[in-house]
Interface confidence: medium
């Protein structure tokens, strides 16, 4: 009975050649969507010269299918029962399930000028920078196309710069052909309460983006756990895109196609300031635009960023603190469209449904030499997009996996 | 078309009180800051003061701090400017001004002249006993 | 303080350029006056927008700390002051320049 089910499930989640768990593993039979929405700038001109809050109004979705590529370099280690893969990122514009084109003009914060003005504090050197910004007819904001604000674009002011420095900018550039990794986690063989749990990432087993424990990678990469998860668990996980480990705790019970799912959801604990939760104090790096660590709800990961002041929330400031949503207009959080959840089956441990949200914002202040920079009178964490990242179970997979699995122990 | 019209000017007394109306028309008033500047016979164009579209943000001339006060009337369409404790030196052309923005400025101490896209006629105020 | 000069001249048909100095890299707005007291047009806003009723000819740049109206093909109904309009965010003053008297020969 119960023995054979659980010895059955020890050994499919293996991840190694011949289980079920290694064939899904390698590549996602789930289709996986990343939907984009783009915070239009409504008043770029009224922002630039009175520093008034920003309008802002947003536009999508924009739909991508995402992570249909197998993971590559796949490299059993036998000897410390880990598994290391590459995986590579690609996006195919899905214009059935998205609002418009990626010739879509969107107004936007100048993502190279803020970037800039950031990086290179130094009064002398801003005079110069305020030069080139002028010539190169560059402003706060400027107008880009969907694919050139997220896959990249030659930026004019970046290009007069007289030194090697990289003029194409883009959210997500570069992105396609390219792979995240290298990963190496272990395979389960040993131990199947270990399975899918990273060991290292890019050959280290800490981020050496924050300090102490907040360095360390923890748990899976999210698209499953170890097998028999309990509801008072913390499930841990690793995302890359946030460049931190985050947690997620039991929400509910969720019917999915027949399958029965734990739904987990990341806490608003997780996005908290260190005032109310001590444990986040490590993921302050700054004490200026965290009001002395007293904001919460954003994240800043420029350190992960080449010192681009990327500030990453969930959508539409959800959890965030008003301080720094009070300089944004058109804003309306809300639990269920911006929360990330994750829905998995407690038997395999296996995540047959989620979504995972998340906003991605950048930092502007006031620069008096920079002209396009020197009338704002306070600092903006300006939202440029969020998006909704989705995956579930299709039907074919949800009738075998009640068959084989929730079937048999029912 | 954007119209601005001034009204209120005048023979006033030095030491009293004067009331200029600005009534505008042709846009929609409640999305656009005003304010009024001011000229002197043969002189050049002084600032005054300025009100942010919801009536926030208000902003006075050096030369006036403390004896003007600016207001508006979104449901009229209507900004007003009183000014007391009359002195020669408040004799001229009073200029209604429209900003192309819904605020003059934020949390600064002063309006932008540069940020001016529509004026009125103007209305002549003399001080004088 | 706002320097720009007191008079230019130019024939019709020609380019003229007033200049407008401030403290620091700034925006400007130019405003025409036909005669003393009399009403006031914005003719650019912000250095470089034009109201939709103002001719092509006329244009607005910056240079630094400097700011520049140019009229293209100046006409007879051109003559005028222009004062020129900024605000230092430095320092949080507005300023209006003394005005450049437009004479078309």
């Known amino acids: 009975g119960d023995m054979l089910i659980q010895k059955t499930i020890k050994k499919e989640v293996v991840l190694e050649e011949g289980t079920i768990a290694f064939k899904n593993w390698v590549k996602t039979g789930t289709e996986i969507y990343r939907q984009f929405w783009i915070f239009d700038v409504q008043n770029p001109q009224e922002v630039m010269m009175n520093s008034s809050n920003i309008q802002v109004k947003q536009r999508g979705p924009y739909t991508y299918r995402v992570r249909f590529l197998a993971k590559e370099n796949i490299t059993q280690d036998p000897k410390d029962n880990t598994v290391s893969f590459l995986q590579p990122n690609g996006a195919i514009f899905e214009p059935s399930l998205s609002v418009g084109t990626e010739a879509d003009n969107f107004t936007v914060l100048n993502l190279a000028v803020a970037a800039a003005s950031h990086i290179y504090p130094n009064p002398f050197v801003q005079v110069v920078l305020n030069s080139l910004i002028n010539k190169s007819k560059s402003s706060m904001f400027q107008v880009r196309t969907l694919r050139e604000l997220l896959w990249g674009y030659t930026d004019p002011f970046l290009s007069l710069v007289p030194y090697p420095v990289s003029t194409r900018v883009g959210m997500f550039y570069p992105y396609n052909n390219t792979a995240d990794g290298v990963y190496k986690v272990f395979n389960g063989k040993d131990s199947i309460s270990k399975v899918a749990i990273i060991d290292t990432y890019k050959g280290k087993r800490n981020l050496s983006y924050w300090e102490s424990y907040c360095d360390m990678i923890n748990g899976t990469d999210a698209a499953s756990f170890p097998p028999f998860v309990e509801k008072s668990q913390v499930l841990q996980f690793f995302s890359s895109d946030i460049c931190r480990s985050i947690y997620a705790v039991f929400e509910s019970d969720v019917n999915l196609k027949g399958i029965p799912v734990y739904r987990f959801v990341l806490p608003s604990k997780a996005f908290a300031s260190p005032v109310q939760n001590p444990d986040n104090h490590c993921f302050c790096t700054e004490k200026i635009i965290s009001k002395n660590c007293t904001s919460y709800g954003v994240l800043d990961i420029s350190k992960c960023k080449e010192g681009k002041p990327v500030y990453i929330s969930l959508p539409h400031f959800l959890y965030a603190s008003p301080d720094v949503s009070e300089t944004i207009d058109g804003l309306n959080p809300n639990e269920e469209e911006h929360r990330t959840y994750l829905d998995i089956e407690p038997i395999t441990g296996f995540t047959l449904q989620f979504a995972k949200r998340l906003q991605v914002n950048l930092l502007v202040k006031p620069s008096n030499k920079i002209q396009v920079l020197k009338r704002l009178k306070r600092n903006y964490i300006v939202p440029i997009l969020w998006l909704n990242e989705t995956g579930t179970i299709g039907d074919e997979k949800a009738k075998m996996f009640r068959s084989q699995v929730t079937g048999k122990i029912n | 078309a954007v119209t601005l019209d001034e009204s209120g000017g005048g023979l006033q007394t030095p030491g009293g009180a004067l009331s200029l109306v600005c009534k505008a028309s042709?846009?929609?008033?409640?999305?656009?800051?005003m304010g009024w500047v001011r000229q002197a016979p043969g002189k050049g164009l002084e600032w005054v003061a300025g009100?942010?579209?919801?009536?926030?943000?208000?902003a006075y001339g050096s030369a006036v701090k403390g004896r003007a006060t600016i207001s508006r009337d979104n449901g009229q369409s209507t900004v007003r400017l009183q000014l007391s404790n009359l002195r020669a030196e408040d004799t001229g052309v009073y200029y209604c001004a429209k900003s192309a923005y819904g605020d003059w400025f934020y949390g600064s101490s002063g309006p932008y002249a540069d940020s001016i896209d529509a004026w009125g006629h103007g209305t002549e105020v003399i001080v004088s006993s | 303080a706002l320097t720009q000069p007191s008079s230019v001249s130019a024939s019709p048909g020609e380019t003229v350029k007033i200049t407008c100095s401030g403290s620091s890299d700034s925006w400007y707005g130019w405003y025409q006056q036909k005669s003393p007291g009399s009403a006031l047009v914005t003719v650019i806003y912000d250095s470089t927008n034009r109201p939709s009723s103002i001719p092509s000819r006329f244009s607005g740049s910056t240079s630094g700390s400097t700011g520049t109206l140019t009229i293209t093909g100046v006409r007879a109904d051109d003559e005028a002051v222009y004062f020129c309009g900024s605000f230092d965010s430095s320092t949080d003053s507005t300023a209006f320049g003394a005005g450049t008297t437009l004479t078309v020969l």
């Open positions: 009100k942010a579209k919801d009536g926030g943000g208000t």
């Open positions: 042709g846009f929609d008033f409640s999305s656009y800051a």
